[in-house]
């Protein structure tokens, strides 16, 4: 089975870890695909290791484990993310995460434009 946090949130400009946990007594993971909606983020395979899709190569870092670290988040990154675990002999298992990217707390407080360096 796949276990994951169904809903997560993170701040704009920040980073988030996307993580699915697969558990089985018999099946072994052979490949894991990560997608943002329909768009490929990254793939891991036992044979080949990690490949991050070129579209996301400046913002997606493999790991920890079989998860992904998604950096420099924008509001447009809000949406559904899917992990697909290819296993042998168990078949294919899918997990879903909904990521909500929120305005940074500074923006919400109206301070983003007015921060200054300390005097001295």
């Amino acid at each position: 089975t796949i276990d994951t946090k169904r809903n997560i949130s993170a701040e704009e400009g920040g980073s988030v870890i996307l993580q699915c946990h697969f558990s089985s007594d018999t099946a072994e993971v052979t490949q894991v695909d990560w997608k943002q909606q329909d768009q490929l983020l990254a793939i891991y395979s036992v044979d080949l290791g990690w490949h991050v899709a070129s579209v996301f190569s400046d913002r997606v870092v493999p790991g920890p484990s079989l998860g992904l670290t998604f950096q420099s988040l924008t509001m447009n990154d809000t949406g559904e993310y899917f992990c697909t675990y290819h296993t042998y002999p168990g078949g294919i298992y899918k997990g879903r995460i909904f990521l909500k990217v929120q305005e940074s707390s500074d923006d919400r407080n109206g301070l983003a434009q007015f921060q200054t360096a300390p005097l001295g």
């Epitope: 695909d33 997608k35 490929l40 395979s45 044979d47 080949l48 579209v55």
Partner: antibody, heavy 118, light 107 residues
């Protein structure tokens, strides 16, 4: 540098047999699924067969099923296509191809021409 | 089998033109769509994988978009070396299938 070098093509009569080879170098052959794709003269690309990295799983186009057999020898870094009961419509350039993650073809060989004619 | 329909089958364009080629799948294939360029007498070359990811070493004037059933390959400013035939290919399920090709010719 990744290289895929096909050989074994040539002229064969209808009903005859041919064995194509693809020698791979420049990468860990045993980690990749490998495919054969063909192209008839002046036509488009047609997928022929595929084999997983460990040789445990293979698949074929309906047009060649039961006549062609894909195999590999990971110790020799070589992919094979045994073609039996050849027909005129099998005439084509045959390419071997590397397919990472079973997703896209990132490297192709230069191709070998198979001509089936009496 | 999943059918891949490419259009147009051929087009004439000039250096510097923006060129768009479309590919339609007979059923949803998510983003399991790749684009290749082939020049006469040569093997195909991967341009775009997973619908929108640019293969390493391919010029940035090439871009891909789409998901589900409708996909597009765009060449933002056609260069002399881009005159070739372009193929889409789905890897959602076997048998893998290719579009019929689009030949880009000099106007």
């Amino acid at each position: 540098e990744v290289q895929l070098l096909e050989s074994g093509g040539g002229l064969v009569q209808p009903g005859g047999s041919l064995r194509l080879s693809c020698a791979a170098s420049g990468f860990t052959f045993s980690s990749y699924s490998m495919h054969w794709v063909r192209q008839a003269p002046g036509k488009g690309l047609e997928w022929v067969a595929a084999i997983k990295s460990d040789a445990g799983t293979s698949g074929y186009a309906d047009s060649v099923k039961g006549r062609f057999t894909i195999s590999r020898d990971n110790s020799k870094n070589t992919l094979y296509l045994q073609m039996n009961s050849l027909r005129a419509e099998d005439t084509a350039v045959y390419y071997c191809a590397r397919v990472p993650y079973d997703y896209w073809i990132d490297y192709w060989g230069q191709g070998t021409l198979v001509t089936v004619s009496s | 089998d999943i059918q891949m329909t490419q259009s147009p089958s051929s087009l004439s364009a000039s250096v510097g033109d923006r060129v768009t080629i479309t590919c339609r799948a007979s059923q949803s294939i998510s983003s399991y769509l790749n684009w290749y360029q082939q020049k006469p007498g040569k093997a195909p070359k991967l341009l775009i994988y997973a619908a929108s990811s640019l293969q390493s070493g391919v010029p940035s004037r090439f871009s891909g978009s789409g998901s589900g059933t409708d996909f597009t390959l765009t060449i933002s400013s056609l260069q002399p070396e881009d005159f070739a035939t372009y193929y889409c290919q789905q890897s959602y399920s076997t048998p893998l299938t290719f579009g019929g090709g689009t030949k880009v010719e000099i106007k």
